[in-house]
């Protein structure tokens, strides 16, 4: 019943997240990737 | 000159703990993010792990993740990788790298060895 | 994860004669700046890697002119026009465009 509705879609958000982490890790911002290299690069 | 020097490698049990070390001279190190790379013996390179130049943010490899640890000591000049439970695949020459220039790896270290053996 | 495959795998060259090795990545390294970040990395025997080429096609401070790099998109290239003793060893390819940073499996460039 409605239980199961809810608890199925807490799992789809978990799974949601997940997958939103993912994608942020992989595409930082610019600004953010560039702090793994030489910082100075291209600043202003 | 500009240089890296690992230390720290050795033979371990599986499942012990190692910390690795990279002592950098030469060069402004808190204005670079740094990485580790390893190789394992007659293998090619993988990647582990990197972190920015002022420690606020850090990636894994997944092969690593939630076992190994990437951190920096600027006042001292200092990369460090904390290994936990370690496993036979994880024995390797590790590689502390400097993040350069255009995205790249310019400068490289000489290497310390792990071994995880009983 | 970006997959970046390599050929030839192995290259036995004629000293004084040209050698090519190839690269492919499984995705575009082409960032959201623009740029493409892969670079090429020369290991001799019993040494740690070394940085020839960044950013496709630009050399690294030190390295012999007899190195270039091309390519754009998914292929690249990396060319040594007149290939010398101190080249044997081997050349990898690698992506910093995004995590995790993936390395080519190797060439091995020898002498014939």
């Known amino acids: 019943g409605g239980g199961g509705s809810k608890h199925k879609c807490v799992q789809n958000s978990l799974v949601n997240n997940e997958t939103l982490e993912s994608i942020m890790n992989t595409l930082e911002s610019e600004e953010d990737f560039r702090k793994y290299f030489y910082y100075l690069e291209g600043s202003k | 000159q500009v240089q890296v020097v690992e230390s720290g490698g050795g033979v371990v049990q599986p499942g012990r703990s190692l910390r690795l070390s990279c002592a950098a001279s030469?060069?402004?190190?808190?204005?670079?993010?740094m990485h580790w790379v390893r190789q394992a013996p007659g293998k090619g390179l993988e990647w582990v792990t990197v972190?920015?130049?002022?420690?606020?943010?850090?990636n894994y490899a997944d092969s690593v993740k939630g076992r190994f640890t990437i951190s920096r000591d600027n006042s001292k000049n200092t990369l460090y990788l904390q290994m936990n439970s370690l496993r036979a695949e994880d024995t390797a020459m590790y590689y502390c790298?400097?993040?350069?220039?255009?995205?790249?790896?310019?400068?490289w270290g000489q290497g310390t060895m792990v071994t995880v053996s009983s | 994860d970006i997959v970046m495959t390599q050929t030839p795998l192995s290259s036995p060259v004629t000293l004084g004669q040209p050698a090519s090795i190839s690269c492919r990545s499984s995705?575009?390294?082409?960032?959201?700046?623009?740029?493409?970040?892969l670079s090429w990395l020369q290991q001799r025997p019993g040494q740690p890697p070394r940085l020839l080429i960044y950013?496709?096609?630009n050399r690294f401070s030190g390295v012999p002119d007899r190195f270039s790099g091309s390519g754009a998109g998914t292929d690249f290239t990396l060319k040594i026009s007149r290939v010398e003793a101190d080249d044997v060893g081997v050349y990898y390819c690698?992506?910093?465009?995004?995590?995790?940073?993936?390395f080519g499996p190797g060439t091995k460039v020898d002498i014939k």
């Open positions: 030469g060069f402004t190190f808190s204005n670079y993010g």
């Open positions: 995705q575009s390294l082409v960032r959201s700046d623009g740029n493409t970040y």
């Open positions: 690698m992506q910093t465009t995004q995590f995790p940073f993936t």
């Open positions: 790298a400097r993040g350069g220039s255009g995205f790249a790896f310019d400068i």
């Open positions: 950013k496709i096609s």
């Open positions: 972190i920015s130049y002022d420690g606020s943010n850090k």
